[in-house]
């Protein structure tokens, strides 16, 4: 499956949509910024095999999809942009799932992968907790939007893993 190409294209589209979704000036939200501790160092220090990269990226996109599919999210963003963004994420999930099926039979280290997936889940838990604590304020959503854009850009090592032949 030609995942690096399609994922890169969809990722760019998702980023552009996310960029367009901004509703308020982020400069009015400087005091609300928060460190969510994206597990960048864990990812950077690891050479991902293709199946590992797929499953961790799938988890990241799934968690992002869940985050932006809530009622609170629907109230925060312009509906048509949110729908386009969700559709883009859904397509990415489908692409990744199709690739997993093609990659069956490839050896994997499940325990190591579980650690990365757990790190991603904890990261999104921190984001959800922050939104709850901030009562889903417009500034809280703006901070989260910037964080998700950054996490999409951060996962370069995962994308390198997609190009690898297992």
């Amino acid at each position: 499956c030609d995942l690096p190409q399609t994922h890169s294209l969809r990722n760019r589209r998702a980023l552009i949509l996310l960029a367009q979704m901004g509703r308020i000036s982020p400069f009015s939200c400087l005091k609300d910024r928060h460190e969510f501790r994206f597990p960048e160092e864990e990812f950077d220090g690891h050479q991902f095999q293709k199946t590992q990269a797929i499953s961790v990226l799938h988890e990241m996109i799934q968690q992002t999809f869940n985050l932006f599919s809530t009622e609170d999210s629907s109230a925060a963003w312009e509906q048509s942009l949110l729908e386009k963004f969700s559709t883009e994420l859904y397509q990415q999930l489908n692409d990744l799932e199709a690739c997993v099926i093609q990659e069956v039979g490839v050896e994997e280290t499940p325990l190591m992968n579980e650690d990365f997936i757990l790190a991603v889940r904890k990261y999104f838990q921190r984001i959800t907790l922050y939104l709850m604590e901030k009562k889903y304020s417009p500034c809280a959503w703006e901070v989260v939007r910037a964080e998700i854009m950054r996490s999409f850009s951060f996962s370069t090592n995962l994308k390198k893993g997609l190009r690898r032949k297992d």
């Epitope: 552009i16 400069f27 910024r33 928060h34 460190e35 501790r37």
Partner: antibody, heavy 120, light 111 residues
Framework: QVQLQESGTVLARPGASVKMSCKAS????????MHWVKQRPGQGLEWIGV????????TYNQKFKDKAKLTAVTSANTAYMELSSLTNEDSAVYFC?????????????WGQGTTVTVSS | DIVLTQSPASLAVSLGQRATISCRAS??????????MHWYQQKPGQTPKLLIY???NLESGVPARFSGSGSGTDFTLNIHPVEEEDAATYYC?????????FGSGTKLEIK
């Protein structure tokens, strides 16, 4: 690769206005904030303001809000800064710079600078 | 406005030694785990170059001899071991609140 190409040297009279340009290439122009920074000869750096080309949103340093006007034309991938009511204090090099890492608000790529000289 | 005071204004360091540049903010630029302080290098006739962001994160492609530390109001840029090509002016910049401001610069000379 990312490039920011600024317009050339400008010589202007006191009281006049000048408009300088910054043409971006190598990245998605509409999805990155663009900062403008001033540097007087032999001196430090001053942040003027920032524009989001995607929707034209601007935020200014209050010190420059009556001096500088930031605009962008997305079809040309170009950001502009207009300086009005020029005085000798406005003689400086002006840089356009791309915002980096979203809300960290640091600057990764810089244009080569436009030199403005105000003289009668 | 937050004032950033850099010291020293200039320093001369021998090749291979350590250069330490300080930047003090008139108000804290740290919130919730991040310190919004960044460092740039500007060589004569060139544009500034980002070295360090968020107080201690090394920008991609910047040599590991550059390091940043600090939080709240006190920040430091260290260069060790200093090389000839490090002769430049170094600026700190904060993005803690509006307006963003820069320090007045520290000129590093290599002996």
């Amino acid at each position: 690769q990312v490039q920011l190409q600024e317009s050339g040297t400008v010589l202007a009279r006191p009281g006049a206005s000048v408009k300088m340009s910054c043409k971006a290439s190598g990245y998605s122009f509409t999805t990155y904030w663009m900062h403008w920074v001033k540097q007087r000869p032999g001196q430090g750096l001053e942040w003027i303001g920032v524009i989001y080309p995607g929707n034209g949103d601007t935020t200014y340093n209050q010190k420059f809000k009556d001096k500088a006007k930031l605009t962008a034309v997305t079809s040309a991938n170009t950001a502009y800064m207009e300086l009005s009511s020029l005085t000798n204090e406005d003689s400086a090099v002006y840089f356009c710079t791309r915002n980096y890492k979203y809300d960290y608000y640091t600057m990764d790529y810089w244009g080569q600078g436009t030199t403005v000289t105000v003289s009668s | 406005d937050i004032v950033l005071t850099q010291s020293p204004a200039s320093l001369a360091v021998s090749l291979g030694q350590r250069a330490t540049i300080s930047c003090r903010a008139s108000k804290s630029v740290s919130t919730s785990g991040h310190s919004y302080m960044h460092w740039y290098q500007q060589k004569p006739g060139q544009t500034p170059k980002l070295l360090i962001y968020l107080a201690s994160n090394l920008e991609s492609g910047v040599p590991a001899r550059f390091s940043g530390s600090g939080s709240g109001t006190d920040f430091t840029l260290n260069i060790h071991p200093v090389e000839e090509e490090d002769a430049a002016t170094y600026y700190c910049q904060h993005s803690g609140e509006l307006p963003f401001t820069f320090g007045s610069g520290t000129k590093l000379e290599i002996k």
